[in-house]
């Protein structure tokens, strides 16, 4: 379930601490509900960006099955449909740290209607 | 080239347990996530569990879950699927695989042990 | 969970000539980043599961480029453009977008 989510986010906030990564990421930091799961879908794009930069097995997995989790979770609520949301690359770019921020605060949403 | 030996299956009463081994070689074993896939006689194929490469983190079908555990072991190469509860319809030839990272090519299982067959029957 | 089921399943074709097997998922296989993991598999009589395909229509290296996959959504296609003698086998389909990962009942290729 999502509870999960974030502790993978954190497990991987963490990690990441101990290393030096500068990447920026699209972060979408003000999500409209109705453009929830194409937010989801550019935050995990980004995150196979993090796991690839790292080169980190421990961030590997992680990553790996917090994408896992996220495709179950979204696919047992069937297939949701959303138009007129941002392309990943409109999104604006900013830090590691900000884009995790901002990653559990759309998964929360996701608690927050389920 | 890539090599992937399972061991350890047989005879086992249903109820007993059994514990199968995949001795993998020729690449970076600690580099990838590896399946368990099984084949009871004359029928089909079922995937029965994945781990990660680090061994944190496991996936099971209903059908086993609960009674079978992966783990691995990177120090000796090995990979190893523990069985309890056996059933009848566990009865099958039991294939190690390697599996290819979503974030670098796509899931896939790309190499493929000889497969070890395991019994279950009184 | 996502049901695979395969078509036909047993395909008596002669040396030389195409063969194609349907693979249809019981629900879009498309995950949320987008990406379709449908895999196709040969097993050969008496040998282990061998790769073929992933990703839809990705032929892994190796593979003789007579097979091709194809397909989106919730319906996909092997085909085999002159089938050879050594094509002799079950073929099955596999979706890992998501867990429980599932395998079609497999399809029999044969030599008429």
């Known amino acids: 379930n999502w509870v999960n989510v974030i502790s993978d986010l954190k497990k991987i906030e963490d990690l990441i601490q101990s290393m030096h990564i500068d990447a920026t990421l699209y972060t979408e930091s003000d999500v409209h509900p109705s453009c929830k799961v194409t937010a989801m879908k550019c935050f995990l794009l980004e995150l196979q960006v993090i796991s690839h930069e790292s080169g980190d097995t421990d961030i590997h997995d992680t990553v790996e099955n917090l994408i896992i989790l996220a495709n179950n979770i979204l696919s047992s609520n069937g297939n949701i449909t959303e138009s007129g949301c941002k392309e990943c690359e409109e999104l604006e770019e900013k830090n590691i740290k900000e884009f995790l921020q901002s990653f559990v605060h759309i998964v929360q949403m996701f608690i927050n209607t389920s | 080239e890539v090599r992937l030996m399972a061991s350890g299956g047989g005879l086992v009463q249903p109820g007993g347990s059994l514990r199968l081994s995949c001795a993998a070689s020729?690449?970076?074993?600690?580099?990838?996530?590896m399946s368990w896939v099984r084949q009871a006689p004359g029928k089909g194929l079922e995937w029965v569990a994945t781990?990660?490469?680090?061994?944190?983190?496991?996936y099971y079908p209903d059908s086993v879950k609960g009674r079978f555990t992966i783990s691995r072991d990177n120090s000796k190469n090995t990979l190893y699927l523990q069985m309890n509860s056996l059933r009848a319809e566990d009865t099958a030839v039991y294939y190690c695989?390697?599996?290819?990272?979503?974030?670098?090519?796509?899931?896939?299982?790309?190499?493929w042990g000889q497969g070890t067959l395991v019994t279950v029957s009184s | 969970d996502v049901v695979m089921t395969q078509s036909p399943l047993s395909l008596p074709v002669t040396l030389g000539q195409p063969a194609s097997i349907s693979c249809r998922s019981s629900?879009?296989?498309?995950?949320?980043?987008?990406?379709?993991?449908l895999e196709w598999y040969q097993q050969r009589p008496g040998q282990s599961p061998r790769r073929l395909i992933y990703?839809?229509?990705n032929r892994f290296s190796g593979v003789p480029d007579r097979f091709s996959g194809s397909g989106s959504g919730t319906d996909f296609t092997l085909k085999i453009s002159r089938v050879e003698a050594e094509d002799v086998g079950v073929y099955y389909c596999?979706?890992?977008?998501?867990?429980?990962?599932?395998f079609g009942q497999g399809t029999k290729l044969e030599i008429k």
């Open positions: 695989a390697r599996r290819v990272s979503m974030i670098t090519g796509g899931w896939a299982m790309d190499y």
């Open positions: 020729e690449f970076t074993f600690s580099n990838y996530a």
């Open positions: 781990i990660s490469r680090g061994g944190d983190y496991t």
């Open positions: 629900q879009s296989i498309v995950d949320i980043t987008g990406n379709t993991y």
């Open positions: 990703k839809v229509f």
């Open positions: 596999f979706q890992d977008s998501f867990v429980p990962y599932t």
